[in-house]
């Protein structure tokens, strides 16, 4: 019979013969022959292959370097890579999460719109009229100005986006 020019899914062509690929988690030891099947071997410790393959070496699991602020989110297996995430207070600098940076703080006059996660930074927003933030924080939202009226007081000093209003007693002298 004519030697094949293409092979089925999960097979590869070598020496005019279709051989089975190795399944995820296993590497190629030797190609099949007319008389023998493909020989595969499971990946070793800290190694993986995540596709049907003919690789002779497995890939190393990603190392979550604590010096870069990284920690293991999900331990790798023979079929999956390790997933890293950042330590508390830090977030990934890229989708691949190869290093981390400290969460940004929102300056006075700005509040936290969205708290940072392991993969996204803090999102800040300017405090609108009626709200203020007088601290630099990665967690604090803009606070509403104090309502002097509800305390039976009057505004003695107007608030800003960075300061609260100052309330004082009502002037009791009437004309």
């Amino acid at each position: 019979p004519e030697p094949p020019t293409a092979c089925r899914e999960k097979q590869y062509l070598i020496n005019s013969q279709c051989c089975s690929l190795c399944q995820p988690g296993q590497k190629l030891v030797s190609d099949c022959t007319e008389f023998t099947e493909t020989e595969c071997l499971p990946c070793g410790e800290s190694e993986f292959l995540d596709t049907w393959n003919r690789e002779t070496h497995c890939h190393q699991h990603k190392y979550c370097d604590p010096n870069l602020g990284l920690r293991v989110q999900q331990k790798g297996t023979s079929e999956t890579d390790t997933i890293c995430t950042c330590e508390e207070g830090w977030h990934c600098t890229s989708e691949a999460c190869e290093s981390c940076v400290l969460h940004r703080s929102c300056s006075p006059g700005f509040g936290v719109k969205q708290i940072a996660t392991g993969v996204s930074d803090t999102i800040c927003e300017p405090c609108p009229v009626g709200f203020f933030s007088n601290v630099s924080s990665a967690f604090e939202k803009c606070h509403p100005w104090t309502s002097c009226e509800t305390k039976d007081l009057v505004v003695q000093q107007a608030g800003t986006n960075k300061t609260d209003v100052v309330c004082g007693p009502q002037d009791r002298l009437r004309a």
């Epitope: 089975s20 988690g25 030891v29 030797s30 022959t33 008389f35 023998t36 099947e37 493909t38 020989e39 595969c40 071997l41 499971p42 070793g44 410790e45 331990k75 297996t77 023979s78 079929e79």
Partner: antibody
Framework: EVQLLESGGGLVQPGGSLRLSCAAS????????MSWVRQAPGKGLEWVSA????????YYADSVKGRFTISRDNSKNTLYLQMNSLRAEDTAVYYC?????????????WGQGTLVTVSS | QSALTQPASVSGSPGQSITISCTGT?????????VSWYQQHPGKAPKLMIF???QRPSGVSNRFSGSKSGTTASLTISGLQAADEADYFC???????????FGGGTKLTVL
Amino acid sequence: EVQLLESGGGLVQPGGSLRLSCAASGFTFSRNAMSWVRQAPGKGLEWVSATGGSGISTYYADSVKGRFTISRDNSKNTLYLQMNSLRAEDTAVYYCARGYSNSWWYFDYWGQGTLVTVSS
Amino acid sequence: QSALTQPASVSGSPGQSITISCTGTSSDVGNYNLVSWYQQHPGKAPKLMIFEVNQRPSGVSNRFSGSKSGTTASLTISGLQAADEADYFCSSYTTSSTYVIFGGGTKLTVL
């Protein structure tokens, strides 16, 4: 019908040697990985050694490494286990087992076993 | 001491379901989907019941099923029958140089 028939077991003194054979029939021998698995009397199973279909790749448990040698003769459909420097703890029924396709870590057909007794 | 931990015995009545656990580590059961289960009747050779965690070889009843969560694999037998009374061994590939490890075996008694 797949058949595996072990032979070569017996009584041997500590430090002695034995060669086990496993005659295979009912399948294309060279297409399957093969293993030896043993079971001490009244105990559990212990994988001993394996070889790929071609016989080039061989694998051994730590407990037998350097003392046992697995080999195969595909022209004779026979698997072998050469056991040297035998110890009392090697006493067991030795099973020849066929690897499931090319996966020698699964055993889909087993022989009836041959008893190896190491004693003085 | 076995590398994989199984209960020494389990029992069930005909028609019931039973589950046998097999606990390993992140170096074996947790790392590989290369878990298998064997049934062994007294004086007989073992028989492959499950491979690759949950795959049944042809000819094995669908009353036998396998699963895995983390570092523990399980064999479930539903609709227990008297013929199911036997020893059951789990096995896994391992990252250690021992390559293949077994559990100590579980004796199943059908009451």
